[in-house]
């Protein structure tokens, strides 16, 4: 069916950057200025996105691809194709509806965006805190407390005693 359709439909021969012009006997015409077609066989070209105001042009529109926007410094992109700009915060902060707020004690954020996350709980992995956490940085976990105790050595521990009631083999 696909092959039959393409044989009968002259529009399928129109490459990206053109459109199938019904007003000109379905000739492939170039996309007009400020429009594009990213795939072949299109009957119209799409209007290029305009990056206006705080949306800055990251990539210009071409006949085969839409423009790409980003946000003015101080804000970052959010949403598909940078449909929104969201405020940056400093490291050690998170964005709330009240603006940028410092991370609560026990949490950190090492980026200009995103939320404050809890410090790693080293003890869950049987480790100790080597470097304390801050608002900007997670804690650094070190060896387990047992490994740090005086007299601890790397000698293999003795085999566990046999359970009572078992005679030697």
């Amino acid at each position: 069916f696909e092959r039959t359709r393409s044989l009968q439909d002259p529009c399928s021969n129109c490459p990206a950057g053109t459109f199938c012009d019904n007003n000109r006997n379905q000739i492939c015409s170039p996309c007009p200025p400020n429009s594009f077609s990213s795939a072949g066989g299109q009957r119209t070209c799409d209007i290029c996105r305009q990056c206006k105001g705080v949306f800055r042009t990251r990539k210009e529109c071409s006949s085969t691809s839409n423009a790409e926007c980003d946000c003015t410094p101080g804000f970052h992109c959010l949403g598909a194709g940078c449909s929104m700009c969201e405020q940056d915060c400093k490291q050690g902060q998170e964005l709330t509806k009240k603006g940028c707020k410092d991370c609560c004690f026990g949490t950190f954020n090492d980026q200009k965006r995103g939320i404050c996350r809890p410090w790693t709980n080293c003890s869950l992995d049987g480790k100790s805190v080597l470097v304390n956490g801050t608002k900007e940085r997670d804690v650094v976990c070190g060896p387990s407390p047992a490994d740090l105790s005086p007299g601890a050595s790397s000698v293999t521990p003795p085999a566990p005693a046999r359970e009572p009631g078992h005679s030697p083999q």
Partner: nanobody, 123 residues
């Protein structure tokens, strides 16, 4: 077409006042959080204030607290920023911006922006 148009900027002396307005069209204004954002010459974009749909929540950046007041009139699709005790460091282009769908829940992104109005504070 979804649009925001700011007005009310101008030249004012330190200590003076200005009232900025923003008129919305092409969407249901009363459904959205709204924001004022500014950009001082040579500086990054800075969020100034926001307001929720029914004016029960208003928040400000620390540097304008007690001097600026955000308000809205949903019947007139309008957002306002009353600026008192203006200082030289308030000089900036002021933008009105719509909080995108889900603003305050999943994100704080702003999807529709005005063209800006310039405020110059100088003696």
């Amino acid at each position: 077409e979804v649009q925001l148009v700011e007005s009310g900027g101008g030249l004012v002396q330190p200590g003076g006042s200005l009232r900025l307005s923003c008129v919305a069209s092409g969407f249901n204004f009363s459904n959205y959080w709204m924001n004022w954002v500014r950009q001082a010459p040579g500086k990054e974009l800075e969020w100034v204030a926001n307001i929720n749909q029914d004016e029960s929540e208003k928040y400000y950046v620390d540097s304008v607290k007690g001097r600026f007041t955000i308000s809205r009139d949903n019947a007139k699709n309008s957002l306002f920023l009353q600026m008192n005790s203006l200082r030289a460091d308030d000089t900036a282009v002021y933008y009105c911006a719509r909080g995108g769908f889900g603003y305050g829940d999943s994100h704080f992104g702003m999807d529709v922006w005005g063209q800006g109005t310039t405020v110059t504070v100088s003696s």
